[in-house]
């Protein structure tokens, strides 16, 4: 079979790499010549968010569109070459590709002309050697025999609480199975919670490594003196300039209302652990702090009265409930709440590159930020999924 | 154009209920927060409460002379607001308006309809 | 709740006069405060929002200022049109409160 690097798959010049993929087997990582970035290589940069510069290389706006600024004596798109020596093509420099297992190569003035940042679990002056603790790419199998009774109990078990044991049987994620899974790149899920930017997290797939890549990182949260106020003035009719930020929530689109909804594909369904009349009642703050989390706005989904789609849940019964509690009828313990993502102002900010494209994407943030114990939410949360449109709906 | 017309009022009997309706046109009611103002003969303007629309879960605020009283409720289907008032106190005699809140403020009112409370 | 204070609750101006209002606020309401119009028999009609803005439609001698707890409303140049009441309004925090208003009459 071919390996994955031999059908050429990155684009404008990039430079395929060999990297494990999440199931063990080979995959690539194509290393981007500014301005391209992607998968592929197969986008054109148009802002620094997307620039890939070198590390320590910072990123400059122009006129002409973003590019790395290069320290002195260095030129070119990725500032690899040396104006020194214009090839630029020394054994020893960057153009070689010398940083093994995914790392990245940093040009530099004295020999060799490079240093290398290696990924986790690599060392050596070309990542060539597995560092002393080597990290385990994903553990097979859950490890704590305990844990195998312990899923599904509604519990989050911390010490089950790992990709071996389905983060405690999905107890701990929001019964999101795996927020990582579509992710390629390897241990992201260890790197989700470093406060650091990892460029291989930041995709989509990989949950955009918690915002961290963007600026402020996900320290960026609505300013303590707005929040109540922004709670309270959520979807109030009254655009309020200070509340009109993605950590703030959009202010409830109430800044937006010459611009045309964009939402996001499917449905975002939630299990909360409150009764409706409850949790409509508090239903700005509930959904000014989701906004906020998910930095998009969120709406309730209505249904063809125009009613909003919370819906009673009821305790799942055991079959030893009494009769006395058969005859009130099934106990109502919380409320399954169907969201709209509405990503209009998501997409005109600056960093729109990194709205949530369909409700699973954003029930699997949730989920992640769940099962590192990030998820900063006063309501109890017991589920949350993404579903099509076309999911019939509740009666 | 954009319109709203208030109707229902009329005279009550202290203790009675009363329910106004206010008729939306011209605009899409669903998504505006809807707001109910009242004016006493010869006195100035009070705000009675609103709505936010259902996307939001149809938040009501009320000031608290009418709150436990007065309901406000909206059928999105109809676009029309209502007012349900019980209890009726002579001091709710009043022109009742409604008016539409966005961005630029309450920028659409009724005509008002006129509520007396007398016994 | 926050209460509205308008003064003066009357005044009597010539055609061409300046005039002006004033609120006080008994809390800081930041700048969410509204200036209305209100002819007798009508609805009331905003003129300014957010302390200072104009809304649109509304003649340019109407300006507002003030942030805070202290507001002020001025009709540069009153015209026939201006004798009415004003009344302003906090939006900071429900419930939504008036000031009880101040009559402009002809002198």
């Known amino acids: 079979a071919l390996s994955p690097c031999e059908s050429q798959p990155c684009q404008h010049g990039g430079q395929c790499r060999h990297s494990l993929g999440r199931g063990g087997g080979l995959t690539f990582t194509c290393h981007c010549v500014p301005p391209f970035w992607g998968l592929r290589c197969e986008r054109v940069a148009r802002s620094c968010r997307e620039l890939q510069c070198p590390v320590g290389i910072p990123c400059q706006q122009t006129a002409r569109g973003p590019r790395c600024a290069c320290p002195p004596g260095l030129s070119g798109p990725s500032c690899r070459v040396s104006r020194a020596s214009p090839s630029g093509a020394t054994n020893a420099s960057c153009a070689s590709a010398p940083c093994l297992h995914g790392g990245s190569c940093l040009p530099v003035q004295s020999v060799p002309f490079f240093r290398c940042v290696c990924a986790p679990g690599w060392g050596g002056p070309r990542c060539e050697t597995p560092s002393a603790a080597p990290e385990v790419p994903e553990e097979p199998r859950c490890p704590r025999a305990a844990c195998q009774a312990k899923r599904g109990d509604q519990n989050c078990d911390r010490e089950c609480n790992t990709p071996g044991c389905g983060w405690d049987g999905g107890d701990c994620s929001l019964n999101v199975d795996d927020p990582w899974r579509q992710c390629e790149a390897l241990q992201c899920w260890r790197l989700f919670n470093n406060s650091r930017c990892d460029p291989a997290c930041s995709s989509p797939a990989c949950l955009y490594d918690n915002f961290d890549c963007y600026s402020g990182g996900r320290d960026r949260t609505c300013n303590p003196v707005y929040e109540k106020y922004c709670a309270d003035h959520f979807a109030d009719g009254r655009c309020d300039q200070g509340c009109n930020t993605e950590e703030c929530g959009w202010d409830g689109l109430d800044c937006a209302s010459e611009v045309p909804a964009l939402l996001a594909r499917g449905v975002l369904v939630l299990t909360v652990l409150l009764p409706p009349e409850e949790l409509l009642r508090s239903s700005a703050d509930f959904l000014q702090r989701l906004s906020a989390i998910l930095r998009t706005s969120l709406r309730f989904r209505l249904d063809a009265r125009g009613q909003a789609m919370v819906f009673p849940y009821h305790r799942p019964s055991p079959g030893s409930e009494s009769r006395v509690r058969r005859e009130l009828g099934p106990e109502v313990i919380g409320s399954v709440v169907m969201l709209e993502i509405d990503n209009r102002l998501c997409l005109q900010s600056a960093e729109n590159d990194h709205c949530f494209p369909d409700a699973q994407s954003a029930a699997d943030y949730l989920g992640a930020l769940s099962a590192v114990e990030r998820l900063d939410f006063p309501y109890p949360l017991r589920d949350v999924r993404g579903e099509p449109l076309e999911a019939p709906e509740q009666s | 154009q954009v319109q709203l017309v208030e109707s229902g009022g009329g005279l009550v009997k202290p203790g009675g209920s009363l329910r106004l309706s206010c008729a939306a046109s011209g605009f899409t009611f669903s998504t505006y927060v809807m707001h109910w103002v009242r004016q006493a003969p010869g006195k100035g303007l009070e705000w009675v409460g609103r709505i936010r629309s259902n996307t939001y879960g149809g938040i009501t605020d009320y000031a608290a002379p009418v709150k436990g009283r007065f309901t406000i409720s909206r059928d999105d289907s109809k676009n029309t607001l209502y007012l349900q008032m019980n209890s009726l106190k002579t001091e709710d005699t009043a022109v009742y308006y409604c008016?539409?809140?966005?961005?630029?403020?309450?920028?659409?009112w009724g005509q008002g309809t006129l509520v007396t409370v007398s016994s | 709740d926050i209460q509205m204070t308008q003064s003066p609750s009357s005044l009597s101006a010539s055609v061409g006069d300046r005039v002006t209002i004033t609120c006080r606020a008994s809390?800081?309401?930041?700048?969410?405060l509204n200036w209305y119009q209100q002819k007798p028999g009508k609805a009331p009609k905003l003129l300014i929002y957010?302390?200072?803005n104009l809304q649109s439609g509304v003649p340019s001698r109407f300006s507002g200022s003030g942030s805070g707890t202290d507001f002020t409303l001025t009709i540069s140049s009153l015209q026939p049109e201006d004798f009415a009441t004003y009344y302003c309004?906090?939006?900071?925090?429900?419930?939504?409160?008036f000031g009880q208003g101040t009559k402009v009459e002809i002198k």
């Open positions: 957010a302390a200072s």
């Open positions: 309004q906090q939006d900071y925090h429900t419930p939504f409160t």
């Open positions: 008016a539409r809140a966005e961005a630029r403020y309450r920028d659409v």
């Open positions: 809390q800081s309401i930041s700048s969410h």
